[in-house]
């Protein structure tokens, strides 16, 4: 299996009750606006074929996509949560900037691409869905990276 390096976050990042609560509140707010409950972005298909040691790298890719293609374009929505949560997630992304995989990561890119394609295909409702799954993103980052 490919070796991942620098793919670690300090657990203190996930032990801040205020920002954790705000992240979950943002996800809840967005999920209320999400009418497409049949489609899931972060779930078993995303992790399929990805070993536990590769998952932080996988979630880094998902985090970066979510920030750049979803949260930044939608930054005026779901206030006041968005203005607090986006900088928090951006800091996590920055801390994972040196997280890389040595070796073939095609299987990871394939899974991430499916998530990206789903969001793009759904358009704005895909972006809303991605925001509604920020609780899953948060939990997946925590479980994979600490």
């Amino acid at each position: 299996a490919p070796i991942s390096s620098h793919c670690r976050l300090d657990k203190s990042n996930f032990q801040q009750p205020y920002i954790t609560n705000r992240t979950f509140m943002l996800a809840k707010e967005a999920s209320l606006a999400d009418n497409n409950t049949d489609v899931r972005l972060i779930g078993e298909k995303l992790f399929h074929g990805v070993s536990m040691s590769e998952r932080c790298y996988l979630m880094k890719q998902v985090l970066n996509f979510t920030l750049e293609e979803v949260l930044f374009p939608q930054s005026d929505r779901f206030q006041p949560y968005m203005q607090e949560v986006v900088p928090f997630l951006a800091r996590l992304s920055n801390r994972l900037s040196t997280c890389h995989i040595e070796g073939d990561d095609l299987h990871i890119q394939r899974n991430v691409q499916k998530l990206k394609d789903t969001v793009k295909k759904l358009g704005e409702s895909g972006e809303i869905k991605a925001i509604g799954e920020l609780d899953l993103l948060f939990m997946s980052l925590r479980n994979a990276c600490i």
Epitope: K28, S51, M52, G132, N143
Partner: antibody, heavy 119, light 108 residues
Framework: EVQLVQSGAEVKKPGASVKVSCQAS????????IHWVRQTPGQGFEWMGW????????RYAQKFQGWVTMTRDMSNTTAYMELPRLRDDDTAVYYC????????????WGQGTLVTVSS | QSVLTQPPSMSVAPGKTATITCGGN??????VHWYQQRPGQAPVLVIY???DRPSGIPERFSGSRSGNTATLTISRVEAGDEADFYC???????????FGGGTKLTVL
């Protein structure tokens, strides 16, 4: 075939400890979290926590924090759950179950281990 | 006391449809999973992510969710379906798995 095989039934006195094992086979042990869930007639199912077989990292339910210990042995693909200072109300069937994400569903369960606490 | 509310029991005649509900607060952004537990046996996953069916589970089993209620539907009920059925979600704020109290399905 994916299997989780647990150790046999235990009878313990109050104050004693118990260690239940869960041997996994038929899949890559390190790729799924192993959760422990207990079932009692009074309380129904109670989630106790999980162990990440890849790192040995754990997450415990608030009720069991500082009490339960979950470990794993990669060499024999076995997860363990230890409960010290048993009380009468710890009488339950203890299950291990596997989960891909750490926060989702359990697609395979062990057969269960009945732990009876009685003086 | 369970945070997820299920009817304790229900009876259904063979060939009919059984509908088991699971209610809870803020279900909107939670994923609901269902397990079947026959007497003396371990639970078996029958529905995950609200409505997905694992391989090996008959098509007669289906799941849905509307608002704060999730529903497990068993069509053309058979005698072998008699069991306890439990719903489960992950509560992200508590960071724990939560289970319903279970519904005992009796096939008449």
């Amino acid at each position: 075939e994916v299997q989780l095989v647990q150790s046999g039934a235990e009878v313990k006195k109050p104050g004693a400890s118990v260690k239940v094992s869960c041997q996994a086979s038929g899949y890559t042990f390190s790729d799924y979290y192993i959760h422990w869930v207990r079932q009692t007639p009074g309380q129904g199912f109670e989630w106790m926590g999980w162990v990440n077989p890849d790192t040995g990292g754990t997450r415990y339910a608030q009720k069991f924090q500082g009490w339960v210990t979950m470990t794993r042995d990669m060499s024999n693909t076995t997860a363990y759950m230890e409960l010290p200072r048993l009380r009468d109300d710890d009488t339950a069937v203890y299950y291990c179950a596997r989960d891909l994400t750490g926060y989702d569903y359990y697609d395979r369960w062990g057969q269960g281990t009945l732990v009876t606490v009685s003086s | 006391q369970s945070v997820l509310t299920q009817p304790p029991s229900m009876s259904v005649a063979p060939g009919k449809t059984a509908t088991i509900t699971c209610g809870g607060n803020n279900f909107r952004n939670k994923r609901v999973h269902w397990y079947q537990q026959r007497p003396g046996q371990a639970p078996v996953l029958v529905i995950y992510y609200d409505s997905d069916r694992p391989s090996g589970i008959p098509e007669r089993f289906s799941g849905s969710r509307s608002g704060n209620t999730a529903t497990l539907t068993i069509s053309r009920v058979e005698a072998g379906d008699e069991a306890d059925f439990y719903c489960q979600v992950w509560d992200f704020l508590a960071d724990e798995a939560m289970f319903g109290g279970g519904t005992k399905l009796t096939v008449l």
